[in-house]
């Protein structure tokens, strides 16, 4: 009974339940391979509970091990499109602070139009995650085709 | 010590640990694109702890943010099969109540025989998730090739 | 306040937060399809908190339901490479104890160079997970392209 009461009294954030699910806002200017994300209940089913967006990039607020997941679908795409414009590659990484810059997750489209993956990785407060789409193909902005999220798993 | 005791005494369900992993039971009749799922220890490694099955579709019993994941493999498939019978698409969505109907996750097979993805999404008690496979290809019923599951992550 | 103190005093392991993320060490000798994994902070972003490695295979230390995830990318691969050397298949399963041997997750590469998936599955203390890559193609050892992990979800 005491535990249940305590659990209700503590804010969720203190339990370390940081979580975010983002939808694509837009791509960057021509020389910027980054995807720019947005989130919040007004936009549909995206949300940020703990992490924040900094100019369309996801910034972590709590140290811990996170499950990072992503799906990106190319717009109006067929296997022919994908193979003709190869290589198209998606990389998720820590892009700042620069001292912690590293690629966490990388996939190529080859003859497919969608990539989807996930991984566990340690992240620290202040880490900003960038998702770089290299190539000349535009990603779909449909919220069920392109999304990016993180879930705090443990300290 | 007190916390450990309290944790043991509280039923797991009260901690919000709803989780389910399902295996394919069968496809629907010709005009019904839904996949029908089954779960339970008697069937192998599938299970339902919290959510329930309603005529082969997964119904949520606890409000919260969930990780939804799915893998579907097409039966006796080669890249030739997949491309010849294109488009074959898998969509996971809330199909009832009708007021909350929305597509959560969508992938096409293109020249591949398997799709796999996952996403975080808010779900409410009573939401029923449907998995629609459009196209004319039969999915594999092997339990290591086709499966669908949800995991409660936080309120 | 009491709950917060108790949580800090208890070792994380007692909360059941077992988790591991591994990177590829090497492939097996010619007749051994298993991938051999490694993990630890000295190697980069891989880690083991609870599970252990036994000759490159992941051994579970706590009963429960786990989220198992994997991504494998083939080395210096194009869709032509993948299709010419088809079938290349990745299977994740319990390989010991022999009495519990079962395939949990299986994917073929077809014309793609990367497979990625995840599933929920019950695992028991002492279960050893093996990842078998059948075919003649070498997997990439890049840590952002090939990785394997588990996360304890609930008892």
């Amino acid at each position: 009974q005491r535990f249940a009461q305590a659990q209700q009294q503590l804010p969720l954030e203190s339990l370390g339940w940081d979580v975010a699910e983002l939808q694509l806002n837009h791509t960057g200017p021509q020389q910027d391979p980054r995807l720019y994300w947005q989130g919040g209940p007004a936009l549909g089913r995206s949300f940020l509970h703990g992490p924040e967006l900094d100019k369309g990039q996801l910034r972590i607020h709590r140290d811990g091990i996170y499950m990072v997941h992503i799906q990106v679908t190319l717009a109006i795409c067929s296997s022919t499109t994908a193979s003709r414009h190869h290589p198209t590659t998606l990389a998720v990484g820590i892009c700042s602070p620069a001292s912690r810059s590293i690629s966490l997750l990388r996939l190529s489209f080859h003859q497919g139009c969608t990539i989807a993956s996930q991984r566990l990785t340690p992240l620290a407060r202040g880490d900003t995650l960038c998702t770089n789409l290299t190539g000349t193909l535009l990603p779909s902005r449909n919220t069920d085709e392109t999304f990016f999220g993180v879930q705090w798993v443990r300290p | 010590q007190r916390f450990a005791q309290a944790q043991q005494q509280l039923p797991l369900e009260s901690l919000g640990w709803d989780v389910a992993e399902l295996q394919l039971n069968h496809t629907g009749p010709q005009q019904d694109p839904r996949l029908y799922w089954q779960g339970g220890p008697a069937l192998g490694r599938s299970f339902l702890h919290g959510p329930e099955l309603d005529k082969g579709q997964l119904r949520i019993h606890r409000d919260g943010i969930y990780m939804v994941h799915i893998q579907v493999t097409l039966a006796i498939c080669s890249s030739t099969t997949a491309s010849r019978h294109h488009p074959t698409t898998l969509a996971v969505g809330i199909c009832s109540p009708a007021s909350r109907s929305i597509s959560l996750l969508r992938l096409s097979f293109h020249q591949g025989c398997t799709i796999a993805s996952q996403r975080l999404t808010p779900l409410a008690r009573g939401d029923t998730l449907c998995t629609n496979l459009t196209g004319t290809l039969l999915p594999s019923r092997n339990t290591d090739e086709t499966f669908f599951g949800v995991q409660w992550v936080r309120p | 306040q009491r709950f917060a103190q108790a949580q800090q005093q208890l070792p994380l392991e007692s909360l059941g937060w077992d988790v591991a993320e591994l990177q590829l060490n090497h492939t097996g000798p010619q007749q051994d399809p298993r991938l051999y994994w490694q993990g630890g902070p000295a190697l980069g972003r891989s880690f083991l908190h609870g599970p252990e490695l036994d000759k490159g295979q992941l051994r579970i230390h706590r009963d429960g339901i786990y989220m198992v995830h994997i991504q494998v990318t083939l080395a210096i691969c194009s869709s032509t490479t993948a299709s010419r050397h088809h079938p290349t298949t990745l299977a994740v399963g319990i390989c010991s104890p022999a009495s519990r041997s079962i395939s949990l997750l299986r994917l073929s590469f077809h014309q793609g160079c990367t497979i990625a998936s995840q599933r929920l599955t019950p695992l028991a203390r002492g279960d050893t997970l093996c990842t078998n890559l059948t075919g003649t193609l070498l997997p990439s050892r890049n840590t952002d392209e090939t990785f394997f992990g588990v996360q304890w979800v609930r008892p």
Partner: antibody
Framework: QVQLKQSGPGLVQPSQSLSITCTVS????????VHWVRQSPGKGLEWLGV???????DYNAAFISRLTISKDNSKSQVFFKMNSLQADDTAIYYC??????????????WGQGTSVTVSS | DIVLTQSPASLPVSLGQRATISCRAN??????????MHWYQQKPGQPPKLLIY???NLDSGVPARFSGSGSGTDFTLNIHPVEEEDTATYYC?????????FGAGTKLELK
Amino acid sequence: QVQLKQSGPGLVQPSQSLSITCTVSNFSLSTYGVHWVRQSPGKGLEWLGVIWGGGYTDYNAAFISRLTISKDNSKSQVFFKMNSLQADDTAIYYCARNNYYGNLYAMDYWGQGTSVTVSS
Amino acid sequence: DIVLTQSPASLPVSLGQRATISCRANKSVSASGYSFMHWYQQKPGQPPKLLIYLASNLDSGVPARFSGSGSGTDFTLNIHPVEEEDTATYYCQHSREFPLTFGAGTKLELK
């Protein structure tokens, strides 16, 4: 109801080609595949090939060098052409609709058959 | 190619009795959680008619006295009780891989 109606010659000269048209009704050729199967007393039922909704074809390797299957969706017609016929190609030739599932390869509706004799 | 062997070649059976026809493949036709074996009925002067697909599923309009079973390499078609209109030749067909092949047929006759 679903129907497949075949039209084609009954007699073919040796080394000549055989052409059969299968006209379908009450289903779409853009959705369903159509198989060709032949039946002879000596060889029983033999699968020859199939054309899928998207226009792709799969052939029995034993016939691939002399068989062409094509179609015109707008006319609901499937065309079968086999070259270089010999006496042992004498058989009843059937077109048949593939069951709804494209990777099931069962044939749920059949044409009435075209009896073909190869003889000079 | 997968070879299908049907037995018996001819099966005399009395009205109301059970008819059992066997089909054996020289390699497994089961995959992906299904058995890719189908059964057809053919009457003289008519094309074959699909009875059962995926080893055990009755096609629409097929009477419930027909049933199929089996997996891997061994399959069975059962008819019970046999009726007069069941006099025909029955064929099995696999679809595990190309080329699709058929059994040589079993002729069901009334005693």
